[in-house]
């Protein structure tokens, strides 16, 4: 299954990145799981995961990073609390767990760069 | 003449950002010409541009917004004063002036991401 | 030394024709690596622009203005590009210049192409009369 995903993205100076993760449904889904997955340094980290119904809200765990909202076959995430470190891909997975049958599919990742902010001048 | 340049820099949240631009010099040039171009929006633009004796530092005109060292065929370009409206691929343009033959290298750019940086809250 | 001299320019009336030659000495076009050669031309008080290009495998490309009036071609044998120009109109005069780049072709779409462009000859001179 095919899932898209913009190539680049800048995190804003607050440490907040926001991209979609477009996927090519084969079948009528009403349960989707999206996982947001982080490749750096050869490594490949889990940054978040949510499932949904269809229609429904994303719904992150309450101590996740990232939020997330839904329409059709796109997912809005949002990743936040970024610093300079934490640049590198973030790849997409979706998974359509119900009904059968199970469909699979990993976008080729976004990179997001994170600039960590100067810090402001003491107010004396 | 091969000319290479890093893929991406990121500019510091203060606006400035560094890369290297190295060329492969066919000959023993004495006098060698410099020009950062900026590509965006299907247009060329130039940045700046510095003549320099091997051995001896870049002089960029007063106003211009780069300086730069030099240390055998390599130019250390520094780029400041930058905002998110200049991002953009700026391709390095290397040309030996002198002694003959003259030679041409153009590298295939360096995508500069700049984020304008948010303001600092008021100190009353 | 690696030298361009364009020739061919001159006067003539509306709806006439010039054929521009840019000969190279100091290297042949298939063992140097211009990618790309082109025609550029700069009227008095404006940026040079590019006319027409082509790339090492042939391929060419043109500047809307010239197109259906103007072709370009090269003969790799004598290291000659060619600038064959018909129907020219009052707005083509200026000075043209042949030059060289290490890129392909793809560039000379971009607005201040030139600017990725080196071994500028000295120009020929073209002025079309009403």
């Known amino acids: 299954m095919h899932v898209a995903q913009p190539a680049v993205v800048l995190a804003s100076s607050r440490g907040i990145a926001s991209f979609v993760c477009e996927y090519a449904s084969p079948g009528k889904a009403t349960e989707v799981r999206v996982t947001v997955l982080r490749q750096a340094d050869s490594q490949v980290t889990e940054v978040c995961a949510a499932t949904y119904m269809m229609g429904n809200e994303l719904t992150f765990l309450d101590d996740s990073i990232c939020t997330g909202t839904s329409s059709g076959n796109q997912v809005n995430l949002t990743i936040q609390g970024l610093r300079a470190m934490d640049t590198g891909l973030y790849i997409c997975k979706v998974e359509l767990m119900y009904p059968p049958p199970y469909y699979l599919g990993i976008g080729n990742g976004t990179q997001i760069y994170v600039i960590d902010p100067e810090p402001c001048p003491d107010s004396d | 003449m091969h000319v290479a340049q890093p893929a991406v820099v990121l500019a510091s949240s203060r606006g400035i950002a560094s890369f290297v631009c190295e060329y492969a010099s066919p000959g023993k040039a004495t006098e060698v010409r410099v020009t950062v171009l900026r590509q965006a929006d299907s247009q060329v633009t130039e940045v700046c541009a510095a003549t320099y004796m091997m051995g001896n530092e870049l002089t960029f005109l007063d106003d211009s917004i780069c300086t730069g060292t030099s240390s055998g065929n390599q130019v250390n370009l520094t780029i400041q004063g930058l905002r998110a409206m200049d991002t953009g691929l700026y391709i390095c343009k290397v040309e030996l002036m002198y002694p003959p033959p003259y030679y041409l290298g153009i590298g295939n750019g360096t995508q500069i991401y700049v984020i304008d940086p948010e303001p600092c809250p008021d100190s009353d | 030394q690696v030298q361009l001299q364009e020739s061919g320019g001159g006067s003539v009336q509306a709806g006439g024709s010039l054929r521009l030659s840019c000969a190279a000495s100091?290297?042949?076009?298939?063992?140097?690596?211009?990618?790309?050669m082109g025609w550029f031309r700069q009227a008095p008080g404006k940026e040079r622009e590019g006319v027409a290009a082509?790339?090492?495998?042939?391929?060419?490309s043109y500047a809307d203005s010239v197109k259906g009036r103007f072709t370009i071609s090269k003969d790799n044998a004598k290291n000659t590009l060619y600038l064959q120009m018909n129907s020219l109109k009052p707005e083509d005069t200026a000075m043209y210049y042949c030059?060289?780049?290490?890129?392909?072709?793809?560039?000379?779409?971009?607005?201040?192409?030139?600017?990725?462009?080196?071994?500028w000859g000295q120009g020929t001179q073209v002025t079309v009369s009403s």
């Open positions: 082509i790339d090492s495998d042939g391929s060419t």
């Open positions: 100091g290297y042949t076009y298939s063992s140097y690596n211009s990618n790309c």
């Open positions: 030059a060289a780049s290490p890129r392909t072709c793809e560039v000379f779409s971009l607005g201040g192409s030139w600017h990725l462009f080196g071994y």
